[in-house]
Structures are given as structure tokens and as C-alpha cells.
Interface confidence: low
Amino acid sequence: QDKPFLSAWPGTVVSEGQHVTLQCRSRLGFNEFSLSKEDGMPVPELYNRIFRNSFLMGPVTPAHAGTYRCCSSHPHSPTGWSAPSNPVVIMVTGVHRKPSLLAHPGPLVKSGETVILQCWSDVRFERFLLHREGITEDPLRLVGQLHDAGSQVNYSMGPMTPALAGTYRCFGSVTHLPYELSAPSDPLDIVVVGLYGKPSLSAQPGPTVQAGENVTLSCSSRSLFDIYHLSREAEAGELRLTAVLRVNGTFQANFPLGPVTHGGNYRCFGSFRALPHAWSDPSDPLPVSVTGNSRNL
């Protein structure tokens, strides 16, 4: 018997209140299908209904979480229906408050090295899910470690390649409601560095400036980078600018830091728009020193 293929678009992890499209494809080309839910709370809008091509389900509530299968119409079968499809697990997010997601030692990971993703919460989640943006495969299911202050899980990821880099979020769930997930953690961009040659970093008017004076950091390379990223040691964020082709054939970005009050070590990286999470080696560090007191401080 022809077994149809059930899929969910844009994915199986759906925020409460959003919609998800369930599509049932028959290899024999029959486009009428029925849907059934195997577990969790019943979804009355599925019963005794025939769908054509796809079914837009929503606004989604925790009741919609669970395992779905479809059967396609099949005139040559004794029952008139195919065998059940593959299972699709719909997980509904936003039921519990969001956990936190961190990367150790940090979100910039050298090619070939390993990073530990740590998801933690003050809620006692027995399960965590780790999800990468833009990936339709099921999220990674991880067993949480419970403790008095809540729960956490550590996931070791590597060796690092562009295939593992991307924007990650984690979710928590409790054992008796495995498909009802927390709100997503804040997104965490995991970047693989060291894929291309390092750019150069310089300071105008120079790396030593008076407090309150304007300084501009220039990152450049002969490499055809679209984007440059500037980071300051011990700071999590980074500044991002589009590269501009200079007369001398280099691609450059100028980062105006404005009136500076504190020094620090700066580095820049180059990357391509086509592979946003794959960066070059870092430039040599540029120490910016601030001397004296500004009159307007």
C-alpha cells in the first residue's frame, strides 16, 4: 500500500497563536487526505474531515501539541485509504517562560574546535530542545539535570564547521507534557572563525587618544569580504558594517567609535553575506588607549 509523506511547514516547532501547515503527499498523486492525532489532547477540527493537499492549522494552542499522521485517499485499497504516513510531532512553544542559552567558552568558535551550549532555567525542566534556525529536521532532544535552583543541560558541539554554525535557541519541557514547550531562549549566534585569512585593523587618528576624542577603526583586506565585524575583548556583542571597495583594491569598513572614554583591545573579522556564520581569522588585536580627562566629562 502507498504510504504518504506528512510534513509541517515552516517547521514542527510552532509558537502558541501561530499557524502551521500540514501537507500530506501521496506518491501516487492522490491529494485528498485525512489527519489523525495519536496522543495529547484531541483536536476536534480534524475529525471526519477530508483535506485537499494541505491543512492550515491554527491559531495553535497547547492542545494542538502531539503526534500527527495522515492517510491519503487510495481507490485501489479495500478501505479506500492508504496506510498511515510517517509521524510528525508538533511542539507548541510559549507554554512556560523562556530558558537562557549560553556558549562556553564563547559563541565565536575556531574551525575544528568544540563549543559547549548550556541551556538553563529556574523552572525544573526534565527535557530541553535545541533548535537551529532554518533547519527543518527535528530539534535535538536533551535530558535536563534537575537541581534546587532549576534545571540545565550542557551540549558539546564539534568539531566546528560551517555546517554547525548558525542561530540557536533552546526550549524546556516537562515529562508529562513533552510537546508543550517553553518560550524560546533568546537567539544565540554560533559563528565558526578561522575559515579565511585575517584582515588588518588600524585606528585613525591613532591607537592612543585623549578621553572624549573621536576615533575610527578601519578593518581592511584584499579578500572580497562583504561584511566586517568588530569586537571588543570581554564584550559579547559586535559591530557589523558592509565592506566598501577602496581605490587601492582593498575591501574596507570604517567603524566610528565616537568620543571614547575607555580603552580596550579590538579585533575585526571578515565574512561573506552568503555564509553569515562563517568568519575569517581575527585580525591582530589593536589596543586602543585613552589618556587624560576630557574637558566635557
Epitope: K110, G112, G194, L195, Y196, S223, L224, F272, A274, L275
Partner: antibody, heavy 117, light 107 residues
């Protein structure tokens, strides 16, 4: 001008060893990841190994793991491929290539390795 | 491992023609694909990097396109010096893998 010059090829008996070298000039060698790629007679290109600029990251294709070792000497601007337990299927022209801008942008002229009795 | 399939082993063309060489990845490699040309007795030369970026000095009759799993190298107005072997390479994940190659020859 960027130049990569391979050497060390030749005729080797099955089970024997050979060390290939790749001398780099015309660019800051220590900034760049480097690859070895080979092409066997009547076959296509096959990636063999990669080493990052500072030697902290190394990858091999499965067929050479445990037999080949990639290394580099940044002060001497030289890349190496130590090949042991050679087999007839390792017969190929071996190229070193610089990795830059998401591509192997410069290649050496190649050195021929023949594994035969 | 990611398999790069170049289904056309040989392609016959005439000078002035437009020809498209295709490469299919067994899983998504986003845009981490480069195209190489190799002539007999010579080392490979990069034509296209990151799927669609023409390398410095490569004539603009060479164009790369595609993302995900399907990639194409198009040569418009084929010249006699374009007769060579063409290979795609994915550098999305290790081990890096080349396609088996497409030999461009005259009709």
C-alpha cells in the same frame, strides 16, 4: 606573485613512505589554511587533507586517515604531507592549494607519486 | 559525507555555444560551493567561489548560480580555450568533496 611549488614525488613500493613538501612564496603563509588535493590517472580530483593557519585544526579524507600526516612550518613557509603504508590507489598527482575566500585560490603545479612494484 | 553529483561526464559543445554544467549535493550546502577548471597537464584553477562569485581574472562568460543542493556553472560564448575538465567542490563540511567532473569537448 603567489607561488606554490610541490616536491618529493617519485616511485614508491607498496607499503613504503614518502614525504611531500610545498614551498610557498608571494604571500603571508602563516595567515592561510592549506589543503592537499590529488588526481589519480583517469580519475577526478580528490581532497586529501587540510591544516589551519596555526596547525590547530586538521582534517583528512577517510581513505588516508592514520596513514598520512599533514603539517606545516610557518617560519619556513612550507607545507608537508607525510605518507606511509602507501597503496597502489594512492598513485596520483598531488597538489597543494591555498584556502582563501571560500575557495582554493592558488594551486601548485603538482608532484607525481607512483606506488608500484 | 556529502556527495556532489555531476551527472554529465562529458559535454559536447561548439565555439560560441552556451553550456551549463550542473552539480547536485546530497544535502544542503547553502552556498559553500566552488567551481574549478583543469586542463591536461595543468593544475586546477578556481573559477567561481561561494556558488556565484567570479574569481579575480576569470572571464565574465563564466557564471555560477544555485544554493542549497543544486548548482550550475554556465559558460556563455564558449571559446576553444574553455575545453577542459570542470569540477564542483563543497566546503560546507569536512570531508570536502568534489564532483566526479565534467569534460567539455568539441562536437
Amino acid at each position: 606573485d603567489v607561488q606554490l611549488v610541490e616536491s618529493g614525488g617519485g616511485l614508491v613500493q607498496p607499503g613504503g613512505s614518502r614525504k611531500l613538501s610545498c614551498a610557498a612564496s608571494g604571500f603571508t603563509f602563516s595567515y592561510f589554511g592549506m589543503h592537499w588535493v590529488r588526481r589519480a590517472p583517469e580519475k577526478g580530483l580528490e581532497w586529501v587533507a587540510f591544516i589551519s593557519s596555526d596547525s590547530t585544526t586538521i582534517y583528512y579524507t577517510d581513505t588516508v586517515k592514520g596513514r598520512f600526516t599533514i603539517s606545516r612550518d610557518n617560519p619556513k613557509n612550507t607545507l608537508f604531507l607525510q605518507m606511509t603504508s602507501l597503496r597502489s590507489e594512492d598513485t596520483a598527482i598531488y597538489y597543494c592549494a591555498r584556502f582563501y575566500d571560500g575557495a582554493m585560490d592558488y594551486w601548485g603545479q603538482g608532484t607525481s607519486v607512483t606506488v608500484s612494484t | 559525507d556529502i556527495v556532489m553529483t555531476q551527472s554529465q561526464k562529458f559535454m559536447s559543445t561548439s565555439v560560441g555555444d552556451r553550456v551549463s554544467i550542473t552539480c547536485k549535493a546530497s544535502q544542503s550546502v547553502r552556498t559553500a560551493v566552488a567551481w574549478y577548471q583543469q586542463k591536461p597537464g595543468q593544475s586546477p584553477k578556481v573559477l567561481i567561489y561561494l556558488a556565484s562569485n567570479r574569481h579575480t581574472g576569470v572571464p565574465d562568460r563564466f557564471t555560477g548560480s544555485g544554493s542549497g543542493t543544486d548548482f550550475t556553472l554556465t559558460i556563455s560564448n564558449v571559446q576553444s580555450e574553455d575545453l577542459a575538465d570542470y569540477f564542483c567542490l563543497q566546503h560546507w563540511n569536512y570531508p570536502l568533496t568534489f564532483g566526479a567532473g565534467t569534460k567539455l569537448e568539441l562536437k
